[in-house]
């Protein structure tokens, strides 16, 4: 059965800037990735990025860089100033569809310490 | 304008063999997620195949497994179904559908549909 | 496989009335509900995808709604052209699944 993973983690150098990696466990093509934070994009919450692997990037503030870093995992990093700043108890969640297998979705929030969180 | 035009449907005793076509235009066809989907007389839709865009992931349903080969040209902008060893309760409309990733893998455009029936 | 539980099977309703259909899902499905609209004799057409989300040329009458596994489709003022057959489908996990359907008559 495949499986998403989430990391989240707090930038040392700007307190208030996010770094979101998910990656998929498993075969299939991945289709489509879509990040969203304050709970699963279909109960509630927002979507940040969606990334296609052929047709590209697509982005919402306070996002500020979505990227592949392998065919089966992104990273995400989000702004850290504004009023629509994450803190540190916000939840993350990435979706990963794969075809013809369906979606899987994982979520993850800032472990209580400072070190870096895997979530799956 | 996004167009799927199926032929090769036809009357074909059990046990029997037909090979369905799909012609599609309008698009990229070869960015595209693709599926066969029937509709047996008065009765529900069924997915009876699927092929990821770069052909190397299929699905079929037990009911067809073994039975239907799906296959794609992205040369000829085609898709097809290979149907052996036809029994009287593959009798259906057959459809080819593309499926938007964007949309969560809703089919988004789909043929006019090709009758097969079986029958001795 | 998903199960996909439409209801009501056949509805008959009158030009101008409000209409729900729903489609209940044997486990969550997330967001991944569309929604299909079939006359007789003819392809199905999408109308809406992600629970909620109008497909393109979809009339404003038509609104989806739901979340995890009860999901609905609202017609809120029927036009003679809105009867027909209406399909939900789950395209979360394979197979994709459908609903087997609710023909909508004029009463």
């Known amino acids: 059965t495949p499986e998403v993973w989430v990391q989240v983690r707090m930038e040392a150098t700007e307190l208030s800037s996010f770094t979101i990696r998910c990656g998929f466990l498993g075969s299939g093509s991945i289709s489509l990735v879509t990040v969203s934070w304050g709970g699963p994009n279909g109960a509630g919450g927002t979507t940040l990025a969606v990334l296609h692997p052929e047709r590209g990037i697509r982005q919402w503030a306070p996002a500020r860089q979505a990227r592949w870093e392998t065919q089966s995992s992104i990273s995400l990093i989000l702004e850290g100033s504004g009023a629509s700043s994450p803190c540190a108890n916000t939840t993350f969640c990435c979706k990963f569809a794969s075809f013809p297998e369906g979606s899987w979705e994982a979520c993850g929030s800032l472990p209580p310490s400072s070190d870096p969180g895997l979530s799956a | 304008e996004v167009q799927l035009v199926e032929s090769g449907g036809g009357l074909v005793k059990p046990g029997g063999s037909l090979r369905l076509s799909c012609a599609a235009s309008?698009?990229?066809?070869?960015?595209?997620?693709m599926s066969w989907v029937r509709q047996a007389p008065g009765k529900g839709l069924e997915l009876v195949s699927a092929?990821?865009?770069?052909?190397?992931?299929?699905y079929y349903p037990d009911t067809v497994k073994g039975r239907f080969t799906i296959s794609r040209d992205d040369a000829e902008n085609s898709l097809y179904l290979q149907m052996n060893s036809l029994r009287a309760e593959d009798t259906a409309v057959y459809y080819c559908?593309?499926?938007?990733?964007?949309?969560?893998?809703?089919?988004?455009?789909w043929g006019q549909g090709t009758l097969v029936t079986v029958s001795s | 496989d998903i199960q996909m539980t439409q209801s009501p099977s056949s509805l008959s309703a009158s030009v101008g009335d409000r209409v729900t259909i729903t489609c209940k899902a044997s486990?969550?499905?997330?967001?991944?509900v569309a929604w299909y609209q079939q006359k007789p004799g003819k392809a199905p057409k999408l109308l809406i995808y992600?629970?909620?989300n109008r497909f393109t040329g979809v009339p404003s009458r038509f609104s989806g709604s739901g979340s995890g596994t009860d999901f609905t489709l609202t017609i809120s003022s029927l036009q003679p052209e809105d009867f027909a057959t209406y399909f939900c489908?789950?395209?979360?996990?394979?197979?994709?699944?459908f609903g087997q359907g609710t023909k909508l008559e004029i009463k």
């Open positions: 486990q969550s499905v997330s967001n991944d």
């Open positions: 309008g698009f990229t066809f070869s960015s595209y997620h």
């Open positions: 992600y629970v909620s």
């Open positions: 489908q789950q395209a979360y996990r394979s197979p994709w699944t």
């Open positions: 559908s593309r499926h938007e990733d964007y949309f969560g893998f809703a089919m988004d455009s």
């Open positions: 092929i990821s865009r770069d052909g190397d992931s299929t």
